[in-house]
C-alpha cells in the first residue's frame, strides 16, 4: 500500500509540477520594471522569454515577441532551452509514469518492468526539475547582474542637467512559479525513484518443489524467510498464483507466462 | 458622440468641501480610466488625479493627496473629486478627462470644466 | 517630479508659415520596453477645454489636420505646423505621460500678426 501511494504521490506532485514549469514558461512576466525609485509608474514594462510587455495606465498592454533568434541574448536562448529540455523531460516522464502505475495494469506487464519504468521517469522528473530550476536561477542571477549595473549608470547625465532613468528590471512572476515548480517536479522524482525500490524484485521466487528426505516429511522450499513468509501467518490480501503466493504490496516476483489479470 | 459633463461648481471658503462630479455618455464607462485636472486662474495645466478603470488605482498630484479623493460608479457612469480642506490655491477650472485606451496616457476626451473659487 | 519647459512662450505669425515649438523635459520620456516617447501634444483655444492633438510624441490623434506633426525623442520634442491657418490660433501644451505626476509644459501662445 505505501509503495502504490508513494508512486501515486510522485505521479500526482510531478504532473503539478509539470504544469508549473510550462506555466512559468510562456508567462510574460519572467522580469518586471523595479518600482523602488518611482512606485507610481505611467508606464509598466515586463518582460517574458518570449515577448516583452508594456502596460499603460490607461489600461492598455502591448506585448511584442522577440522575432529575432539571432539578436537574443545567449543566456536567455540558455534558460528557453533549459525550460524545453524541462517540459519535453518532464512530459516523456509523465507518460512513462502513467503506464508505471501500480494501480494501473495493462496486459501481463512484468512487475520489473514497472519497477524500470517508475525509476526512468523518477530520473526524468528529477532532471526536468533540476532543469527548471537552472534555468529560473540562470535568468535571476542574469537580472541581478543587470539591475546592479543599471543602478550603476542609473543617471546618466547631460551636462549634470537632464537625467535618463534607465528601466531597472527585478524578479518577476514566473521566477518563483518556475523555482517552486521545479522544486515540485523534482520531489515527485525523487519519491518516483523510493517507489520504484518497493516495486523492484528482491530475489526471483521459484515454484516451491517438496524434497522427501528420508525418514523425515520436511518441506523445503527455496528462498529462505521472504519466501515462507508468504506461507506463514500474514493471509491479508493474498494472490495465489502458481509457483507461490504474495501480497499486492510486498515485494513481487515476475509472474509467470501463464499471469493474466 | 462621447460626452463628458461636470458639475458641483461653487465659491467656498477655505478649509471648506466640495464634491464634484462628471457624467459620461457615449462610451463604455467601465473600460476606460478617468483622471481630473486643473487650470489655474494663470492657465497653467496641473494633473490632480488618477484612477483606473476598475477604481483599483488611485494615484494623486502631491498638492491634492491626503484633501482630495477620486472615486468612480461604474453603473451610474460617472466619475466624482470629492475635495475638502480647500486652499485658495486650489481655485482653478476643474476638467474630467479620459484616457486614451490605446496611446500613452493621453487624455482624448475633456468635459467644458467646472469652476472652483476658495476665497474667503 | 518631470520638468516640462516649453519654448518659446508665444509665438507671432502670418497665415500659411511654417511654425516649430519646443519642449523639453527633465527626465528621458522614452520607454526602452517599446522603444514610444510619452509625450504629447495638447491643442486649448480659448474659452474651450484642451484637445489632443498627437500622442507618443509623434501619433497624430484621429480627425487631426497633417499639417501638425510631432516628433523629437527622449527629452527634446517639437511640434510643427507646416502651414499655419487662422483656426490654429491657440495654446499649444505638452506633457509628460511617462510617469506620475503627469505633468504640462507652461504652454506656446500662437498669435496673428
Known amino acids: 500500500m505505501a509503495v502504490t501511494a508513494c508512486q501515486g504521490l510522485g505521479f500526482v506532485v510531478s504532473l503539478i509540477g509539470i504544469a508549473g514549469i510550462i506555466a512559468a514558461t510562456c508567462m510574460d512576466q519572467w522580469s518586471t520594471q523595479d518600482l523602488y525609485n518611482n512606485p507610481v509608474t505611467a508606464v509598466f514594462n515586463y518582460q517574458g522569454l518570449w515577448r516583452s510587455c508594456v502596460r499603460e495606465s490607461s489600461g492598455f498592454t502591448e506585448c511584442r515577441g522577440y522575432f529575432t533568434l539571432l539578436g537574443l541574448p545567449a543566456m536567455l536562448q540558455a534558460v528557453r532551452a533549459l525550460m524545453i529540455v524541462g517540459i519535453v523531460l518532464g512530459a516523456i516522464g509523465l507518460l512513462v509514469s502513467i503506464f508505471a502505475l501500480k494501480c494501473i495494469r495493462i496486459g501481463s506487464m512484468e512487475d520489473s518492468a514497472k519497477a524500470n519504468m517508475t525509476l526512468t521517469s523518477g530520473i526524468m522528473f528529477i532532471v526536468s526539475g533540476l532543469c527548471a530550476i537552472a534555468g529560473v536561477s540562470v535568468f535571476a542571477n542574469m537580472l541581478v547582474t543587470n539591475f546592479w549595473m543599471s543602478t550603476a549608470n542609473m543617471y546618466t547625465g547631460m551636462g549634470g542637467m537632464v537625467q535618463t532613468v534607465q528601466t531597472r528590471y527585478t524578479f518577476g512572476a514566473a521566477l518563483f512559479v518556475g523555482w517552486v515548480a521545479g522544486g515540485l517536479t523534482l520531489i515527485g522524482g525523487v519519491m518516483m525513484c523510493i517507489a520504484c525500490r518497493g516495486l523492484a524484485p528482491e530475489e526471483t521466487n521459484y515454484k516451491a518443489v517438496s524434497y522427501h528426505a528420508s525418514g523425515h516429511s520436511v518441506a523445503y522450499k527455496p528462498g529462505g524467510f521472504k519466501a515462507s513468509t508468504g506461507f506463514g501467518s500474514n493471509t491479508k490480501n493474498k494472490k495465489i498464483y502458481d509457483g507461490g503466493a504474495r501480497t499486492e504490496d510486498e515485494v513481487q516476483s515476475y509472474p509467470s507466462k501463464h499471469d493474466y489479470v | 458622440d462621447v460626452k463628458l459633463v461636470e458639475s458641483g461648481e461653487g465659491l467656498v471658503k477655505p478649509g471648506g468641501s466640495l464634491k464634484l462630479s462628471c457624467a459620461a455618455a457615449?462610451?463604455?464607462?467601465?473600460?476606460?480610466?478617468m483622471s481630473w485636472v486643473r487650470q489655474t486662474p494663470e492657465k497653467r495645466l496641473e494633473w490632480v488625479a488618477y484612477?483606473?478603470?476598475?477604481?483599483?488605482?488611485?494615484y494623486y498630484a502631491d498638492t491634492v493627496k491626503g484633501r482630495f479623493t477620486i472615486s468612480r460608479d461604474n453603473a451610474r457612469n460617472t466619475l466624482y473629486l470629492q475635495m475638502s480642506s480647500l486652499k485658495s490655491e486650489d481655485t482653478a477650472m476643474y476638467y474630467c478627462?479620459?484616457?486614451?485606451?490605446?496611446?500613452?496616457?493621453?487624455?482624448?476626451?475633456w468635459g467644458q470644466g467646472t469652476s472652483v473659487t476658495v476665497s474667503s | 517630479d518631470i520638468v516640462m519647459t516649453q519654448s518659446p512662450s508665444s509665438l507671432t505669425v502670418t497665415a500659411g508659415e511654417k511654425v516649430t515649438m519646443s519642449c523639453k523635459s527633465s527626465q528621458s520620456l522614452l520607454n526602452s520596453g517599446n522603444q514610444k516617447n510619452y509625450l504629447t501634444w495638447y491643442q486649448q483655444k480659448p474659452g474651450q477645454p484642451p484637445k489632443l492633438l498627437i500622442y507618443w510624441a509623434s501619433t497624430r490623434e484621429s480627425g487631426v489636420p497633417d499639417r501638425f506633426t510631432g516628433s523629437g525623442s527622449g527629452t527634446d520634442f517639437t511640434l510643427t505646423i507646416s502651414s499655419v491657418q487662422a483656426e490654429d490660433l491657440a495654446v499649444y501644451y505638452c506633457?509628460?505621460?511617462?510617469?506620475?505626476?503627469?505633468?504640462f509644459g507652461t504652454g506656446t501662445k500662437l498669435e496673428l500678426k
Open positions: 484612477i483606473s478603470s476598475g477604481g483599483d488605482y488611485i
Open positions: 506633457q509628460n505621460d511617462y510617469a506620475y505626476p503627469l505633468t
Open positions: 478627462s479620459r484616457l486614451r485606451l490605446r496611446g500613452g496616457n493621453a487624455m482624448d476626451y
Open positions: 457615449g462610451f463604455t464607462f467601465s473600460s476606460y480610466a
